[in-house]
Amino acid sequence: MSSLPVPYKLPVSLSVGSCVIIKGTPIHSFINDPQLQVDFYTDMDEDSDIAFRFRVHFGNHVVMNRREFGIWMLEETTDYVPFEDGKQFELCIYVHYNEYEIKVNGIRIYGFVHRIPPSFVKMVQVSRDISLTSVCVCN
């Protein structure tokens, strides 16, 4: 299957019940600290506020944050990272009323509470060290 360009930008319209599904494979061995980053932008430019940033350090930890009024806020982290070295993953980000629920290969790893309404999100960008198979939004 052909891969998508990385970074990959996708215009979106999110609401409660939406799900962003990302399928891909890390392109480096975990010993080289490959990363995956997903950003939920509130406009179509990269200077806009970010409702949700999800950055995976494969084999290590996940860092989440948000950029509000141009200011990065406090990071939230989890050490539960059920990705496998060299194997395809399916990352699903579900939009719930109070939070983004993040699942990897069907396993919940975190809930990131909304501080910016999901309806403000205009673009999802997927970037860093992955071969990207697909990105889709289910409403």
């Epitope: 509130t42 109070n98 501080r115 910016i116 403000f120």
Partner: nanobody, 119 residues
Amino acid sequence: EVQLQASGGGFVQPGGSLRLSCAASGFGSNRSTMGWFRQAPGKEREFVSAISSLSSDPPYYADSVKGRFTISRDNSKNTVYLQMNSLRAEDTATYYCAPAGMRGVMEYWGQGTQVTVSS
């Protein structure tokens, strides 16, 4: 439709206090980070302070107002407040409130409320 209404401004002498209010509606304002900005004549809009909907998140302040201004909110009333103490002449401006994620969308910002600090 997003609606934002700032109020509570006025004329005050240096060293005085004012409490601004921002009533928000038309979006999930009680679950949104809300911020205060100000704009003086001939100057660019300036960030003042922001507060998350979560009590566990610390508020943020511009260096110029730290220790003098306090932001708070009442989620049950969809209202955000800015308590301004030890006011200075340089605090003179029109004050606006806005949710995070909309800082560039001026049509949603309403009229703002004028604060004038002068002796």
